[in-house]
């Protein structure tokens, strides 16, 4: 009785169960009555990452420097190359096919999380008591100056974009 289903790491062909090829190898011949499945290793710059019956290996991803990409992890016969972005850039998608410059946080916003090769800058509004007067991809919100610790008084209130202005205490009582 020919099988209708096969074990794990097997596939059904011509009414018989044949072994799949292991990761890093491609199928060159299905099994027969007289031979096992025949597999061959993937070539240089190729990979297959699963048990498979593929007749061609996949090409490793190319990290194109013209798109701001560089190799983060070199591919093997069983894994694809992982690309990341050059300094100052981050991936536009999870598959990292191209890069864009990190965004800067505008005045009134500070950096909550500095960008990486795969994620953009995360900005946050400066809360009361903090300010940012620059457009930056690195600067966090800074606290307003404490006039009291300098024996000074606030002459001009701070905002989310400006520091307080301190001045001498009024001597007249």
């Amino acid at each position: 009785e020919p099988p209708t289903a096969c074990r794990e790491k097997q596939y059904l062909i011509n009414s018989q169960c044949c072994s799949l090829c292991q990761p890093g190898q491609k199928l060159v011949s299905d099994c027969t009555e007289f031979t096992e499945t025949e597999c061959l290793p993937c070539g240089e710059s190729e990979f297959l990452d699963t048990w498979n019956r593929e007749t061609r290996c996949h090409q490793h991803k190319y990290c194109d420097p013209n798109l701001g990409l560089r190799v983060q992890q070199k591919g093997t016969s069983e894994t694809d190359t992982i690309c990341t972005c050059e300094e100052g850039l981050h991936c536009t998608s999870e598959s990292c096919e191209s890069c864009v410059p990190h965004r800067s946080c505008l005045p009134g916003f500070g950096v909550k999380q500095i960008a990486t090769g795969v994620s953009d800058t995360i900005c946050e509004p400066c809360p009361v008591g903090f300010f940012s007067n620059v457009s930056s991809a690195f600067e966090k919100c800074r606290p307003w100056t404490s006039c009291e610790t300098k024996d000074l008084v606030v002459q001009q209130a701070g905002t989310n974009k400006t520091d307080v202005v301190c001045g001498p205490q009024d001597r007249q009582r």
């Epitope: 011949s29 099994c31 096992e36």
Partner: antibody
Framework: QVQLKESGPGLVAPSQSLSITCTVS????????VHWVRQPPGKGLEWLGV???????NYNSALMSRLSISKDNSKSQVFLKMNSLQKDDTAIYYC????????WGAGTTVTVSS | DVVMTQTPLSLPVSLGDQASISCRSS???????????LQWYLQKPGQSPGLLIY???NRFSGVPDRFSGSGSGTDFTLKISRVEAEDLGVYFC?????????FGGGTKLEIK
Amino acid sequence: QVQLKESGPGLVAPSQSLSITCTVSGFSLPTSGVHWVRQPPGKGLEWLGVIWAGGDTNYNSALMSRLSISKDNSKSQVFLKMNSLQKDDTAIYYCLGHGHFDVWGAGTTVTVSS
Amino acid sequence: DVVMTQTPLSLPVSLGDQASISCRSSQSLVHSSGNTYLQWYLQKPGQSPGLLIYKVSNRFSGVPDRFSGSGSGTDFTLKISRVEAEDLGVYFCSQTTHVPWTFGGGTKLEIK
């Protein structure tokens, strides 16, 4: 039904190269591999190599430097080429289809002699 | 490479006798799938080899039931229960579990 027919030069001078053609019928080269085996006079069988359906090849490591196997799917022909022949390459050369080990060609006799 | 060792080299028999040929491999012929790819061929004088047995014990179609194969791992046997004149020739074992495929040196079955 499956048939294979080998054809070769018969006589080859030492240090010269050998070219043999295997013409197949009853099965398709784009979907099946073809193996080459040889048998020196009065001796055992030796597997030489295979060309798979997609054109990939495996060779006997002892002969790899002198051997190449190619094919022409459109003509249903497989070619064996061997360089730098010596007397001990004198043999009957057989081709057989992968998965058709019940069917061997009649073989072609190759004699290496000056 | 897997070395296939056949014994005896020559086997003189009388017609009607039982004949037994041994084939040993230098490493196990059991594939990770559990299958064992060991074949037996008969080459009659002036002819190409003909398949008798595949996967250790499966008789190829049209092969008489007086031929039987057995064994496992590295040790295999071909038995002919009652030798007939048409059985004379050279018997080869062959393994196709591991590339390169390899053959035994042959056993010549001849009349005493």
